[in-house]
Amino acid sequence: TQNKALPENVKYGIVLDAGSSHTSLYIYKWPAEKENDTGVVHQVEECRVKGPGISKFVQKVNEIGIYLTDCMERAREVIPRSQHQETPVYLGATAGMRLLRMESEELADRVLDVVERSLSNYPFDFQGARIITGQEEGAYGWITINYLLGKFSQKTRWFSIVPYETNNQETFGALDLGGASTQVTFVPQNQTIESPDNALQFRLYGKDYNVYTHSFLCYGKDQALWQKLAKDIQVASNEILRDPCFHPGYKKVVNVSDLYKTPCTKRFEMTLPFQQFEIQGIGNYQQCHQSILELFNTSYCPYSQCAFNGIFLPPLQGDFGAFSAFYFVMKFLNLTSEKVSQEKVTEMMKKFCAQPWEEIKTSYAGVKEKYLSEYCFSGTYILSLLLQGYHFTADSWEHIHFIGKIQGSDAGWTLGYMLNLTNMIPAEQPLSTPLSHSTYV
């Protein structure tokens, strides 16, 4: 007689990443009886919510429900109905909401309140909506990539099942770039972490990890651009800003009120004799790079060494996974290959930024102009941040791996967050019981 397939004993989880520029919903799945095994949870769906980040709904909170509908309905379709009630839903908001909270705690709470009200209308088990800290964002990103790379597994393998696997248990560092903040997280080599705020201690699967992390608020790619514009307009002689970070022939009108809307530009704020100014692109990588460097204060460091703005950074150690906007931008620029040296990346950026705007628009006709116009700045910013901000060198550049997905799951903080909140990362190594692992043939 033929064996009848038993119903799949699986569980699901949903995490919404409420970022500064957009919200994404992730659905994860895992075998119910293997919850404590490492590497069993994987992503089955990503749904990008149409529209901006939730912090932009502050004056129209009643629209949040409609905004979330499509992706929540998608989750309803993907997850079997019998599992709906059991499926936890978490929403974590990042730096966009941190910035809103800095301006008004009441407004930030109003947004989260409406988020809860909207998500409570679905049949899932809603667990909470909150603003995660920068430290958590860094830590959970680090957990995600190392979980997916199999770094927490005690089983050594003679074959490689994941990309970038160096077949050792050395963890990867995590480099995360968002729209409003950027995180750097790694295990330093025998180095004391000189500032307690940047130190994390984990015990995962029976092993202790001393992890360094820092989140630079206002140094995500979008807020960094606002900072740069606010800094440069201070010294402009009129309402024309000739900007090396935009392609030659590019023109855009910016409202001064929009420029000063974010707390990230407060330090550059001044009374200007005009309400609007026009960006005129001149497309010069070197000048753009120089302008970006002025955002990093490297003159002050109260520690043995710093990244910038007086923030402690230990010597870099090991390999790093660079994900989120680090990956999206470099992927667009076709610079994610392991074979491309830092010098080659710089060369390519020089050429790209110098290309006339009309030419760029023709070459990338399918790309929204808003995004297309900013790749020169974003690519240059990534190089500046990694080289001057975090002190990567031409030699250590090869230790940076630009990662979008690992084993089909997106690199980012959401998986680590869910693993932690559902208690799926044990402190101790689970005892191997018979039949608890698949048999290798």
Epitope: Q85, P88, Y90, D109, L112, D113, E116, R117, S120, D125, F126, Q127, G128, A129, R130, L421
Partner: nanobody, 126 residues
Framework: EVQLLESGGGLVQPGGSLRLSCAVS????????MSWFRQAPGQERDFVTA????????HYADSVKGRFTISRDNSKNTVYLQMNSLRAEDTAVYYC???????????????????WGQGTQVTVSS
Amino acid sequence: EVQLLESGGGLVQPGGSLRLSCAVSRGTFSEYSMSWFRQAPGQERDFVTAISGFGHITHYADSVKGRFTISRDNSKNTVYLQMNSLRAEDTAVYYCAAAWQTSPRRMMQMAGSITWGQGTQVTVSS
């Protein structure tokens, strides 16, 4: 970790009303689902009601539905239990409980990591 302090307990006649309060210190209050449990002498601790971080999800034990109402004021970091039409069988020590990023449904099942208050005595007697 959050700290919880209940108040408002006391002696009340059958059919009467009482409002319990639970003040929460430390932590970000809206990140916690809040709950009330009760324990009668010689009995297990039983679930009464729970409420989500911003108050849009509530669950009640069948025995108190329509009589008890849970609410919260996030500006005051306080959760309330309004108890009406009290009965002798409602006599118990009432405990406030908090669970971080945990649904009211899971609190009802006593799942997740729960922080407890010291309890306040409610006696319903004529």
